[in-house]
Interface confidence: medium
């Protein structure tokens, strides 16, 4: 029988007439174009919906917008429209929405051809109100609001400037000119890349790396020969041009580009990218392509300094020019990632880690689940992931895999059970031990949403024709009910719930289609007298994390340390609320050689956890550069793995001499580096 | 020889704070894990915490997160343990001891203990008002 | 945290015959454990690591042994200097916990 149909389901009972009374119908009358919903806060209950119907002319766009306001997660809208003085708005923009709980949005609207600059609208109320204001540019992108201060705004302009402003969009003060990429970094720091001659096109590696502090007072060139760079964690990242020929390298600062290092990886040339695939605090994930158009490459993950990198994975599918790649982190379950790999017959698979990238494998085959056609044998096989890469190819797959950190150890993912994955229709899978062990959860392609925490998922099939059944489980996708939300079907467009997974409300988007018109209509459902009571401690039992042999006594021991969760049992029908905080207990492991990287100038054999050196290195000494200066380094081989937390046991030692002498790489030597003020 | 050398005893008052050292002679200082244990007036013995002299990386027993603070000097191969927020029950022998930990001699993937070979002689704390 | 029971608290034992001292521990330690001598007014002094490997210099009378939660320290003619207060303690997981003590006195 199908996933959850059989008779150990228990049901939730009346749970037709709660949810009845819980399902709010918002038809919009205006007409079918494109539409974009944006949540305004955290627990504010604030949606945006813009809907935009354009009509092409020869000469120019003509278009209309309206723009609607809930403040109940969707149940109710308003049309607000006149707020913003009834203007078209620019959907390339979308709605900029603000940091944190900051109520800030920022719409950017269409203006006729012969205006000096752009317009925008305004709001600091949770879209309360607006506030027209005038640009004295056409921006190129959207507002970028500074993480730290919401009040500072930067955007491009159509001409490549760099245009600033530090009262929300009130007044702007253009900083630079000849600006092809600029970023916040931290303490409301800006960097950005700008060329001397030509173009951002025409100057490509030969760009220069500029930082302002205080909002363009004053400016530091921090790098040269730049062809671009990337922010990630505590990392900047340029790639440089090589000094003799086309190919360039990565450098890396952990000080906002005031001293760079050499990053350890491979050059590229000019029809390979590097691609930051992951990055926090501790380490970074990088993507090196290979040479050619081979549509793969090697992802490497770096120590603490983001300078030595170790090879983690080979033949890592990445389309060429950086377009689709299906590394997706496992956000439920620390250390876990999912990829694909391109196998020598072309073949896609799929990959996990549960270690930051230190062993990669293939995910377990479903235990209710037959070997498709691709397996050569029947009984032995994966369970490989559709992601990005089948979405771009338009197979079947409605959706990315899912994973909330909430949520803790649930991974939703479509999939196919073999060699490889298939072109075929596939089947929703669910992990709940973040990706250990799998189920089929669903026969076909479905939507699908986390609520409160885990407490419920909701799916909707992938249809081509009109849908009124949605479908919810209350036991992490073993059982299903479903629920007829309205009598006349619609066509569905798109799942809608608050970001963050702790809502009980989701908004089910479409449109109706009769003869003369068609109209945009959502259903919002709001679960919560389905989970009638709160969880109480009984609700939840002990789960250790990333426990596969419980005789094992390294057992869960990753990183260097266990963790124990609290989770909700699967029987329990509870709300663990929008307060829920997930309850772990972290406990420390002895170290071993699981637990250290292997240093500058030595390598792991296959199969070995051992590092031994490098062949070509064996002898000499160990020198290398490190923020400018030469150094020295007696190590045996080790370094502690980036967020690795075991104590006591093995510690390989390693020191590192400053030999007090200069070097650099063709990069940027501090005589290069200079400081200008406006 | 390997020698462990604590500072002389302290007495404090409630709510103070006490800081004691632990100097390391006789091998590579940043080699070996030191571990903190300390023992009240008639009763065992209580792990307080460790750290590593590499990177200066600790662990504390939950008991004692928060009030508890160890930190190394690699220069002088010393380890410090500070205690805050003193209290009569903190009145102990806390004792230094290093984890005599190396490249693992029971197969390179096992996580081996090679338990506290070496003590320093302790450090008596009265916390007394 | 992982709890250490020893038992028995107190062993009277006279001096040339055996003594059995054991340690259990609340869940596997696999053989992340090590048994210490303390004396009055001295620092505990390492005997066994690795549930039963002996530690530098330490006569060949103990002995270390079990795996998983039960842990004997086993010493097989008590000389006089033998009489002190006995613990276990487990590394397999922080924080690293003692028994309560095993004291054997001179019968």
């Known amino acids: 029988s199908a996933p959850g149909e059989d008779e150990e389901c228990g049901r939730v009972r009346d749970f037709v007439a709660k949810l009845a009374n819980n399902t709010h119908q918002h038809v919009f009358d205006d007409l079918r174009g494109s539409v974009s919903l944006s949540w305004v806060g955290d627990s504010t209950g604030v949606i945006l919906v813009l809907t935009t119907f354009h009509v092409p002319l020869v000469i120019m766009t003509f278009g209309q917008s309206k723009l609607y306001r809930s403040e109940d997660y969707g149940k109710n809208f308003k049309d607000i429209t006149d707020l913003i003085n009834n203007t078209f708005i620019r959907t390339e923009f979308g709605m900029a929405i603000g940091p944190e709980n900051s109520g800030k949005v920022v719409l950017t609207a269409e203006v006729s051809g012969g205006s000096r600059g752009g317009r925008i609208f305004r709001s600091s109320d949770f879209a309360k109100n607006f506030v027209q204001t005038d640009l004295p540019f056409h921006p190129l992108t959207q507002m970028m609001y500074s993480p730290q201060n919401s009040d500072y705004l930067l955007a491009l302009s159509t001409e490549n400037g760099l245009w600033v402003s530090k009262n929300f969009g009130g007044k702007w003060e253009e900083i630079h000119k000849a600006v092809c990429l600029a970023k916040w970094g931290s303490d409301n720091t800006i960097f950005f890349t700008t060329y001397a001659n030509g173009s951002c096109k025409a100057d490509l590696g030969a760009l220069e790396l500029w930082r302002t502090s205080d909002l363009g007072k004053s400016f530091k060139t921090i790098g040269v020969k730049i062809y671009s760079f990337g922010l990630g964690g505590r990392f900047l990242f340029a790639s440089v041009m090589a000094d003799k020929d086309t190919t360039r390298r990565i450098h890396v600062s952990t000080d906002q580009g005031d001293t760079w290092s050499m990053a350890q990886l491979p050059s590229v040339g000019q029809e390979q990218f590097y691609s930051i695939l992951a990055a926090n605090d501790d380490m970074v994930f990088m993507h090196v392509d290979e040479p050619g158009d081979t549509g793969f490459g090697t992802i490497f993950t770096s120590d603490d300094r983001g300078i030595v990198y170790s090879k983690s994975l080979d033949r890592h599918l990445y389309t060429t020019t950086g377009g689709e790649t299906d590394f997706t982190n496992v956000t439920s379950l620390r250390g876990v990632y999912i990829t694909s790999v391109l196998s020598e017959d072309n073949s896609i698979q799929t990959m996990i880690t549960f270690d930051q990238g230190g062993r990669w494998t293939h995910l377990r085959k479903p235990e209710n689940s037959e070997c498709d056609a691709t397996a050569k044998n029947k009984n032995e096989c994966s369970l490989h992931i559709h992601a990005s890469y089948s979405i771009s190819q338009k197979l079947n797959v409605p959706m990315a895999p899912l994973s909330e950190p909430n949520a803790v150890g649930i991974v939703i993912a479509h999939g196919s059970v073999g060699d490889a994955i298939s072109v075929m229709v596939p089947d929703v899978y669910i992990s709940d031990d973040g990706g250990y062990s799998w189920t089929k959860m669903l026969e076909g392609p479905h939507y699908y949403t986390i609520l409160d925490s885990g407490g419920i998922i909701v799916a909707i099939e992938h249809s081509s024709r009109p849908i009124n059944v949605i479908k919810f489980s209350t036991d992490e996708g073993q059982c299903w009910q479903t629920y007829t939300f309205t009598r006349d079907p619609i066509y569905f467009t798109g799942l809608a719930s608050e970001p963050g997974a702790r809502s009980m409300n989701i908004s089910i988007w479409g449109f109706t289609e009769s003869f003369a018109t068609s109209q945009w209509v959502s259903y919002t459902i709001d679960f919560k007298d389905i989970l009638e009571r709160n969880c109480e401690e009984k609700d939840y039992t002990i789960w250790l994390a990333h426990s596969t042999d419980p005789e094992d006594y390294e057992d869960g021991c990753i990183l260097g340390y266990k963790e124990q969760f609290l989770r909700l049992r699967k029987s329990s029908v509870c709300q663990n609320g929008r307060d829920y905080v997930v309850t772990k207990q972290p406990s420390i492991c002895l170290c071993s050689l699981e637990d250290f990287l292997c240093d500058f100038g030595y390598y792991r054999p296959e199969n070995d956890s051992k590092c031994v050196e490098q062949p070509e290195l064996k002898g000499h000494d160990l020198e290398f550069c490190l923020y400018g200066r030469e150094e020295h380094l007696t190590t045996n081989g080790y370094r502690k793995i980036p967020g690795d937390k075991c104590q006591g046991g093995v510690n390989p030692v390693r020191e590192v001499k400053d030999l007090k002498k200069k070097c650099t790489s063709n990069f940027l030597s501090p005589e290069k580096q200079n400081s200008k003020s406006n | 020889q390997v020698q462990l050398v604590q500072s002389g005893a302290e007495v404090k008052k409630p709510g103070a704070s006490v800081k004691v050292s632990c100097k390391a002679s006789?091998?590579?200082?940043?080699?070996?894990?030191m571990s903190w244990v300390r023992q009240a007036p008639g009763q065992g013995l209580e792990w307080m915490g460790i750290?590593?002299?590499?990177?200066?990386?600790?662990s504390y027993a939950q008991k004692f997160q928060g009030r508890v603070t160890m930190t190394r000097d690699t220069s002088t191969s010393t380890v410090y343990m500070e205690l805050s927020s003193l209290r009569s029950e903190d009145t102990a022998v806390y004792y230094c001891?290093?984890?005599?930990?190396?490249?693992?001699?029971?197969?390179?993937?096992?996580?081996?203990?090679?338990?506290?070979?070496?003590w320093g002689q302790g450090t008596t704390v009265t916390v007394s008002s | 945290e992982i709890v250490m029971t020893q038992s028995p608290a107190t062993l009277s034992v006279s001096p040339g015959e055996r003594a059995t001292l054991s340690c259990r521990a609340s869940?596997?330690?696999?053989?992340?454990l090590a048994w210490y001598q303390q004396k009055p007014g001295q620092a505990p002094r390492l005997l066994i690591y690795?549930?039963?490997t002996r530690a530098t210099g330490i006569p060949a009378r103990f002995s270390g042994s079990g795996s998983g939660t039960e842990f004997t320290l086993t010493i097989s003619s008590l000389q006089s200097e033998d009489f002190a207060v006995y613990y276990c303690?487990?590394?397999?997981?922080?924080?690293?916990?003692f028994g309560g003590g095993t004291k054997v006195e001179i019968k």
């Open positions: 001891a290093r984890d005599p930990s190396g490249i693992a001699a029971a197969g390179p993937a096992s996580r081996y203990y090679y338990g506290m070979d070496v």
């Open positions: 869940q596997s330690v696999s053989s992340n």
């Open positions: 006789g091998y590579t200082f940043t080699s070996r894990y």
């Open positions: 750290i590593n002299p590499v990177g200066g990386s600790t």
């Open positions: 303690q487990q590394a397999r997981l922080g924080p690293w916990t």
């Open positions: 690795g549930a039963s």
